[in-house]
Amino acid sequence: QKKGAPHDLKCVTNNLQVWNCSWKAPSGTGRGTDYEVCIENRSRSCYQLEKTSIKIPALSHGDYEITINSLHDFGSSTSKFTLNEQNVSLIPDTPEILNLSADFSTSTLYLKWNDRGSVFPHRSNVIWEIKVLRKESMELVKLVTHNTTLNGKDTLHHWSWASDMPLECAIHFVEIRCYIDNLHFSGLEEWSDWSPVKNISWIPDSQTKVFPQDKVILVGSDITFCCVSQEKVLSALIGHTNCPLIHLDGENVAIKIRNISVSASSGTNVVFTTEDNIFGTVIFAGYPPDTPQQLNCETHDLKEIICSWNPGRVTALVGPRATSYTLVESFSGKYVRLKRAEAPTNESYQLLFQMLPNQEIYNFTLNAHNPLGRSQSTILVNITEKVYPHTPTSFKVKDINSTAVKLSWHLPGNFAKINFLCEIEIKKSNSVQEQRNVTIKGVENSSYLVALDKLNPYTLYTFRIRCSTETFWKWSKWSNKKQHLTTEASPSKGPDTWREWSSDGKNLIIYWKPLPINEANGKILSYNVSCSSDEETQSLSEIPDPQHKAEIRLDKNDYIISVVAKNSVGSSPPSKIASMEIPNDDLKIEQVVGMGKGILLTWHYDPNMTCDYVIKWCNSSRSEPCLMDWRKVPSNSTETVIESDEFRPGIRYNFFLYGCRNQGYQLLRSMIGYIEELAPIVAPNFTVEDTSADSILVKWEDIPVEELRGFLRGYLFYFGKGERDTSKMRVLESGRSDIKVKNITDISQKTLRIADLQGKTSYHLVLRAYTDGGVGPEKSMYVVTKENS
């Protein structure tokens, strides 16, 4: 290209269909220059024009020769160029924003533009660059790329962006440009120019405002607050903590809070102050709902399902921001809602869901939702297996007979299709409680009835009941307790009887014990005592309770005494005892000692004893007839422990073992004994019978049985030199080596001569008795031996 010829040919396209080629005019040419442009490949096309650019249809692949001939006043000049697609630049048209809008409540910008895809024949990828600028000074806050595809028709595109700063705080600008990436184009691809800028600003009213208002935010997030003000803002605080100010346009300021802490239930104040005023907003920093924990669905009545759960971590959001729960049942599509005004910390929440006819399996989803998010828990239940019955009410007890009652109660709910397992607690006073389980068919009308047998007559029972379904889930709570006295029945046994002859031997005294409540079967009103021999039967008049003794004048013939107990229903079987006593000449009195609480008596088995054995006992010091109590034991026994609340340590008791054969009793053993031996409570009385120059004779008396308090095992006699009313040591004081002790184990011995003494010397004598329970107190005396002759 000659100097002064057209130069710098440059071709661009915005749609790959038309190339816009332009060149620079030769220097010195004026307005009136004409150009002839010829394009040559296989054929040649020429164009006449008066400007330095030409639009030509896009050329197919290959090199083209372009000849530009410039014709001007002072001659012509020609330039030749080789043109190829690779030399062409693809520069999209400057895009235009159709609409920029804002949602101030969420600080979100919404952008809308047209890609003008209809002017572009080929499917192409487009990269858009979107720029957000803030403040009048147009500080860049966001630069983002956005990918779309051109598909031969005009398409609207949308983009939104949530600002970290409330949009009210400052003016926001947006501009866009694009870049087309076409696989079939071998030329240069370049960015379009930036679109004309669009902006969003908030028109403040007369009042200073703080933004955002009432914002709910996740704990740990960052947030920006601003104050749009006509006055100069002096300070900003979150809670009572000062924050550095970020200056915006005019008097507007912002603060940035990083890693925000959880708020109080009423929120946290963010405050901006001016010289004369204070302006605020409240921030609620909390958590999204935790996954509901321990979701459990059950029913009390097969009418209503109660789903309960624990909310888990506290959200710190209450009132209108609290978590709302929706329980959805997926098979039926039905749902119920719970909106909590306050959020208690550890409390379990619950929702009620009405059961649906003919539906047993329920698939529940519990959705939790608050302004910060949502969560859910699911549970699949066969509700007939999740019955937690109500507490049984109207619990009543009615008599059937003396050993059976009818229990009735109310259990609300429609249980026609299931069975109940009910546990009845039966408690007798001073007795172990008994549990009985019954299976009952569920009913529609909520009233239940069960018979309870194998009870004792005339017994005060306390009943209560609880129920569960047969496919156990949970027991109901226990019903109220119901006390009930069963009706009376005839006494089931005759009284335990014994007899003693009076001290003069003329009267037979009959004793009997009150029947235990489980044998009396009612309140015993009286006793009938009769006496029969081979010739006759004699009845005494009726003896009212609580008299348990009768006296009959009898000769020494054989009689059978019969005692019958009567209550309001009837009489007991008779208790029979023979008056005859079989003599036993071979009796020795034995000694027995107990074990603190009772006394163990043993004997040899005797096949002749066909009815039973009787052990009777009494206090030795009591006068005849000696009877304190008796105990009957079966004929096959060889031992028994006698215990009684009346037994006292140190008291001597007489024990008699009787064996029964042919309805007559024979005394087999006679024993005296103690439940527990104690030491004697008195010392033996002793006197000096004789003294000589070298000996003393001492004599003592028996200690009365009552004061012995055990079996006498011996005496301890101490003697040593000593004088009355001197400071010389007493006999029993420790450390004396000259004291002598005699242990007298022959308890029949009542005298003792002490020899080898010194003449005309004072001796201190001490006597003590002892049992296996210990040594008794001392009795002492001072004696002076005679002078040696």
Epitope: D205, Q207, T208, V210, Q213, D214, L237, I238, G239, H240, S263, A264, S266, G267, T268, N269, V270, V271, T273, D276, N277, I278, F279, G280, T281, V282, G319, P320, A341
Partner: antibody
């Protein structure tokens, strides 16, 4: 229990001064913002002034700005209102009121709870 | 300043009836900054509701608050004899803190 007791009210001539006190008990006085609110006879409530928990910031209603001064003595648990250049329209029952929430918990700007029983100021010649 | 208007000025009702009191703001007020007070003759005001809907300690649940923006409501579901009094709304979100002129609830 939380208690606020106002004192210092009375009859005063226009142009003169008066100082009201409010004795606080039953709470940590130094953690709460405090307010004065007044009520003219037969009229509604009008906020007068606020002082921050630490006494550093004070704000006033336009009607009293430049004439009234709010102050506090945290060591004595007492709030004050110094009223100068009194006018007839200042005649009212003056209540002191506490912020409903501690500044340490929620920050500043809170509802008013509790209120004192009030003290009557009469400005008359 | 934010001006609060209350309506009606007077509400004449019988015990057991429902009372609905309205409070309107001259510009938007954060619901976190709206309170309701009750005042009986010769007594200091008593806080009922704060944060537009949160009941103060010891306030019976027949009192409830609602609303946002510029419109707020205090509802007394069932008037008791002790509820006849003057009720004030208040905004405390920006100074000057302002009260409404009050609604008097009296016995019909």
């Amino acid at each position: 229990q939380v208690q606020l007791v106002e004192s210092g009210g009375g009859v005063v001539q226009p142009g003169r001064s008066l100082r009201l006190s409010c004795a606080a008990s039953g709470f940590t006085f130094s953690s709460y913002g405090m307010h004065w609110v007044r009520q003219a006879p037969g009229k509604g409530l009008e906020w007068v002034a606020v002082i921050w928990y630490d006494g550093n910031n004070k704000y006033y209603a336009d009607s009293v700005k430049g004439r009234f001064t709010i102050s506090r003595d945290n060591s004595k648990n007492t709030l004050y209102l110094q009223m100068n250049s009194l006018r007839a329209e200042d005649t009212a029952v003056y209540y002191c009121a506490r912020d409903g929430e501690s500044s340490m918990v929620r920050g500043l700007l809170n509802w008013f709870d509790p209120w004192g029983q009030g003290t009557l100021v009469t400005v008359s010649s | 300043e934010i001006v609060l208007t209350q309506s009606p000025g007077t509400l004449s009702l019988s015990p057991g009836e429902r009372a609905t009191l309205s409070c309107r703001a001259s510009q938007s007020v954060s619901s976190s900054y709206l309170a309701w007070y009750q005042q009986k003759p010769g007594q200091a005001p008593r806080l009922l509701i704060y944060g537009a809907s949160s009941r103060a300690t010891g306030i019976p649940d027949r009192f409830s608050g609602s609303g946002s923006g510029t419109d707020f409501t205090l509802t007394i579901s069932r008037l008791e004899p002790e509820d006849f009094a003057v009720y004030y709304c208040q905004q405390y979100g920006s100074s000057p803190f302002t009260f409404g002129p009050g609604t008097k609830v009296d016995i019909k």
